[in-house]
C-alpha cells in the first residue's frame, strides 16, 4: 500500500549521511561536463574548489549552463535518454556548458533510500553552484537545471539550497511516490527557480502514480492528459521491445517526458503547443483551445516564462513518436434535435479537408453525453498541417448489429412507433484552430438538408463570411 512509501530520512531521524552507499573510492556525486559531441565520450569531471580544472575542462563562464540530473536507477548505469538529451542540448546551444550530475551510487538503491538521498544530492549541486557564483562572470540566471523523475526533486532541492535564484528548472515527469502532497520545501516547487516548467507523462489517477499528479511548477503540462501516452500501449511495447512487459510500458510513459523535451530541442520547426485548462476532461471536450491572456505556451525547451501568481495546468495531444507535434481543432456543433436517441450515443466522425492536406476520419469523442438543442464542443487533432480548412464531412457510423443494439432499436420503436429513425439536425459547425487561433464557420451545402442518421454523411462548406480571425497575427508567431 501507499503507506509503505511514507517519507523518511528527515529532520526527525537525521539521515544526513547518504543511505546505502557502497564504500568505494568513486565520489557519490560527480559533475561531468560533456565537451565532446560523441555521447559515449567520458567528459571531464569538475571538482568543487578547483578553478584550474574548470579552465582545463573548457567551462565557459558567460554561457548558459545546463545541469542534467538523472533519477532512480535499477541498473546503476546511465540510460540511453541521457545521451540523447546531452546531444540535443549541445546541438541547440553550441556554446553552452552541459553538465551531467552523476549521483548513480546514491540512486542505485532501494527507492526509499534513493528518495532519502535527494536532499543531500541537491545540497551538493547547490554547493557547486555557490562555488561557481564566486567567479565574477558566472550568473545563476544562466543556469537551467533539468531533472528527470527523482532528479526533478533533486533539482528542486538544489534551487532551494543555492544562495540566490537559478534561472530555470525543468521537471521531466517528477517522481510521485513519497512526493505527492508533501510540504512545499520537500519537493520541486515554483519557489525553486525563477521559472519552473514541468512535463507530466505518467500520472495515474488510481493506485501508485510513478509521476507526480499535482502541479509543482509555474506551468505544469500534461501531454495526452498526463496518463496514457500514444505508442506506449501494450501492443506498441510488444512490437518495439524484445519483451513487452509492464515495466517497459511504465518506462515508455515515464520517459516520454524526456523525449518530448528532446523533441522541443531538435524539431524547432515543429513546436508543440499546450493550452491552459482546469482539467483533462474539459480539454478532451475541446473547451480549452484559447491563447488569450497567456493561456497557451510552447512545451519543453521553448516554453515561455509565465508571470503567474498561481500555477497553470496545461494540456495537449501528441503523436506517438518524434516529431510529437499535432494540430488541435475545436469543433462547436449545434445539435438541433436528436430523435429516438435511446440510450446509445451516436458514433460520429469528421473529415477535414484543407488547402495543404486532408485529415483521416477523426472520431468525435463524446466525453459526457450529447446535449440536445445545445452547442456541443469536441476536440479533434491531426498529425499534419492541413492549411486553411475548406470543407468537412460528418459521418454517423452505422449501428453495429449486436443483440443489445437491436433490442434498443426495438424498444425505441415501441416507444415512438410513428418515427423509428434516429436523426440529428446540424446546420453549422464552428471550427477553431488551436495553433493559429483562426476560426471558421461551416454550413451545410443545402440548408434544407441538415439531418443525419446512422450510416449517413453530411457535407459542410465554408459559410459566406469565411475565415474569421480576431487577432491579426497568431500569438504563436511570437511563441515560436
Amino acid at each position: 500500500s501507499i503507506t509503505t512509501l511514507r517519507p523518511q530520512g528527515s529532520l526527525r531521524d537525521e539521515h544526513h549521511k547518504p543511505t546505502g552507499v557502497p564504500a568505494t573510492a568513486r565520489p557519490s556525486v560527480a559533475f561531468n561536463i560533456r565537451t565532446s559531441k560523441d555521447p559515449e565520450q567520458e567528459g571531464c569531471n569538475l571538482s568543487l574548489g578547483d578553478s584550474k580544472l574548470l579552465e582545463n575542462c573548457g567551462f565557459n563562464m558567460t554561457a548558459k549552463t545546463f545541469f542534467i540530473i538523472h533519477g532512480w536507477t535499477m541498473s546503476g548505469m546511465f540510460e540511453s535518454w541521457l545521451h540523447k538529451l546531452v546531444s540535443a542540448l549541445q546541438m541547440r546551444e553550441k556554446d553552452a556548458n552541459v553538465v551531467v550530475v552523476d549521483w548513480l551510487p546514491l540512486a542505485h538503491q532501494l527507492y526509499t533510500d534513493a528518495v532519502n538521498n535527494t536532499r543531500v544530492v541537491g545540497q551538493r549541486v547547490a554547493g557547486m553552484l555557490d562555488w561557481l557564483q564566486e567567479k565574477e562572470e558566472f550568473s545563476l540566471g544562466n543556469v537551467h537545471l533539468i531533472g528527470y523523475s527523482l532528479g526533478a526533486h533533486v533539482a528542486g532541492y538544489a534551487g532551494n539550497f543555492v544562495k540566490g535564484t537559478v534561472g530555470r528548472i525543468t521537471g521531466l515527469d517528477p517522481a510521485g511516490p513519497m512526493f505527492e502532497g508533501v510540504d512545499i520545501n520537500r519537493r520541486l516547487s515554483p519557489d525553486d527557480a525563477d521559472f519552473v516548467d514541468v512535463l507530466h507523462t505518467y500520472t495515474l489517477s488510481f493506485g501508485l502514480s510513478i509521476g507526480i499528479r499535482m502541479p509543482v511548477g509555474h506551468i505544469d503540462i500534461y501531454p495526452n492528459g498526463g496518463d496514457f501516452q500514444p505508442g506506449c500501449g501494450f501492443n506498441d511495447v510488444i512490437g518495439s521491445f524484445a519483451y513487452g512487459t509492464i515495466s517497459e510500458m511504465v518506462k515508455c510513459e515515464h520517459e516520454r517526458a524526456v523525449h518530448l523535451f528532446v523533441d522541443s530541442l531538435v524539431n524547432q520547426d515543429k513546436p508543440s503547443f499546450a493550452f491552459q485548462c482546469t482539467d483533462s476532461s474539459r480539454f478532451k471536450r475541446g473547451i480549452c483551445l484559447s491563447c488569450r491572456k497567456n493561456r497557451c505556451n510552447n512545451i519543453g525547451y521553448n516554453a515561455k516564462k509565465m508571470r503567474k501568481k498561481r500555477n497553470s495546468k496545461m494540456y495537449l495531444k501528441t503523436r506517438a513518436g518524434m516529431p510529437f507535434k499535432v494540430y488541435h481543432y475545436q469543433l462547436k456543433v449545434h445539435m438541433f434535435s436528436y430523435n429516438n436517441s435511446g440510450d446509445t450515443q451516436p458514433t460520429l466522425y469528421i473529415t477535414l479537408y484543407g488547402s495543404n492536406a486532408d485529415s483521416q476520419n477523426l472520431p468525435l469523442e463524446i466525453v459526457e453525453k450529447i446535449e440536445l438543442n445545445a452547442t456541443n464542443t469536441f476536440l479533434v487533432y491531426t498529425e499534419e498541417d492541413l492549411g486553411d480548412l475548406l470543407k468537412m464531412r460528418l459521418t454517423w457510423e452505422g449501428v453495429a448489429h449486436s443483440w443489445y443494439n437491436l433490442w434498443n432499436e426495438f424498444r425505441n420503436y415501441l416507444s415512438q412507433p410513428s418515427n423509428p429513425s434516429r436523426e440529428l439536425y446540424i446546420r453549422r459547425i464552428r471550427v477553431k484552430s488551436g495553433e493559429t487561433q483562426r476560426k471558421v464557420t461551416f454550413c451545410t451545402q443545402d440548408p434544407t438538408k441538415s439531418s443525419i442518421s446512422p450510416g449517413q454523411e453530411l457535407w459542410f462548406h465554408k459559410c459566406q463570411d469565411g475565415w474569421k480571425m480576431k487577432n491579426k497575427t497568431s500569438p504563436f508567431v511570437n511563441l515560436a
Epitope: 517519507p7 528527515s10 529532520l11 526527525r12 537525521e14 544526513h16 536532499r119 545540497q123 547547490a126 532551494n160 539550497f161 543555492v162 544562495k163 540566490g164 505527492e180 502532497g181 508533501v182 510540504d183 512545499i184 520545501n185 520537500r186 516547487s189 515554483p190 519557489d191 499528479r213 499535482m214 498561481r310 500555477n311
Partner: antibody
Framework: QVQLVQSGAEVKKPGASVKVSCKAS????????IAWVRQAPGQGLEWMGE????????KYNKKFKGRVTMTRDTSTSTVYMELSSLRSEDTAVYYC?????????WGQGTTVTVSS | DIQMTQSPSSLSASVGDRVTITCKAS??????VAWYQQKPGKSPKLLIY???YRFTGVPSRFSGSGSGTDFTLTISSLQPEDFATYYC?????????FGGGTKVEIK
C-alpha cells in the same frame, strides 16, 4: 533530540520594533526551513514567513512584508525575527517552528505585548 | 491566497466518542494538508501531514483523510488528553494558511 528555544517575553510601545530569537539544536541547522507563526490572544495561528538558514533565503507573508525581517546566525544556530512599526494588534505569542513534513517541532513561544 | 475553512469552530464530546473535524480549502491543495493539536498555554504539535500520514509518536486513534479541497481529521475514540484545539494547514503553496481552529471540549 530536536529543540527550539526562544527568547523571553517583551513589552513594547507602538511604533517600536521587537527582535525575537530562536536557538535550534539536535539537527543540521542549515538544512531545514524555520518558520515564524504568531497567535493573538484567543485567536488562531498565522504564518508570518520562514527562513532557510543555509542560504539565508526567506519567504514572507505579504501581509507583513516590509515590517518583518528574518535573519540567522549560523555560528550559534539561531534565527531571528524582527517586527517593526509595532501596533496594538501585534500583541501575540510568536512561535518559531522547524519545517520538514509540516511544522514538525515548535519553540515554546515568546509573548510580545504592544501597549502605550 | 488559499483560504482554509474549518468546521465546526467548537464541539462538545465525551471520552470514547468518535470525533470528526473538517477543513475545506478555497482551491485544490491535492493532499498537501497538515493537522495540529494545541493545548492551552502550549505550542502546537504536528499530528498529521500529507493529509493522511501520522507524525512520529502520534497515537493511531488520530487519522486524516481527503484530497483536493475537502479534508477530515478523525479521532476514533476520544481520550481525556485529546481535549484541545485542532488546526488544519495547507502546505501546498506560499503563503501557508491555517484553518480557524476547532475547539474540542468536554461535554
Amino acid at each position: 533530540q530536536v529543540q527550539l528555544v526562544q527568547s523571553g517575553a517583551e513589552v513594547k510601545k507602538p511604533g517600536a520594533s521587537v527582535k525575537v530569537s530562536c536557538k535550534a539544536s539536535g539537527y543540521t541547522f542549515t538544512t531545514y526551513w524555520i518558520a515564524w507563526v504568531r497567535q493573538a490572544p484567543g485567536q488562531g495561528l498565522e504564518w508570518m514567513g520562514e527562513i532557510l538558514p543555509g542560504s539565508a533565503k526567506t519567504k514572507y507573508n505579504k501581509k507583513f512584508k516590509g515590517r518583518v525581517t528574518m535573519t540567522r546566525d549560523t555560528s550559534t544556530s539561531t534565527v531571528y525575527m524582527e517586527l517593526s512599526s509595532l501596533r496594538s494588534e501585534d500583541t501575540a505569542v510568536y512561535y518559531c517552528a522547524v519545517y520538514d513534513y509540516g511544522a514538525d517541532y515548535w519553540g515554546q513561544g515568546t509573548t510580545v505585548t504592544v501597549s502605550s | 491566497d488559499i483560504q482554509m475553512t474549518q468546521s465546526p469552530s467548537s464541539l462538545s464530546a465525551s471520552v470514547g466518542d468518535r470525533v470528526t473535524i473538517t477543513c475545506k480549502a478555497s482551491q485544490d491543495v491535492y493532499t498537501a494538508v497538515a493537522w495540529y493539536q494545541q493545548k492551552p498555554g502550549k505550542s502546537p504539535k504536528l499530528l498529521i501531514y500529507s493529509a493522511s500520514y501520522r507524525f512520529t509518536g502520534v497515537p493511531s486513534r488520530f487519522s486524516g483523510s481527503g484530497s483536493g479541497t475537502d479534508f477530515t481529521l478523525t479521532i476514533s475514540s476520544l481520550q481525556p488528553e485529546d481535549f484541545a484545539t485542532y488546526y488544519c494547514q495547507q502546505h501546498y503553496s506560499i503563503p501557508r494558511t491555517f484553518g480557524g481552529g476547532t475547539k474540542v471540549e468536554i461535554k
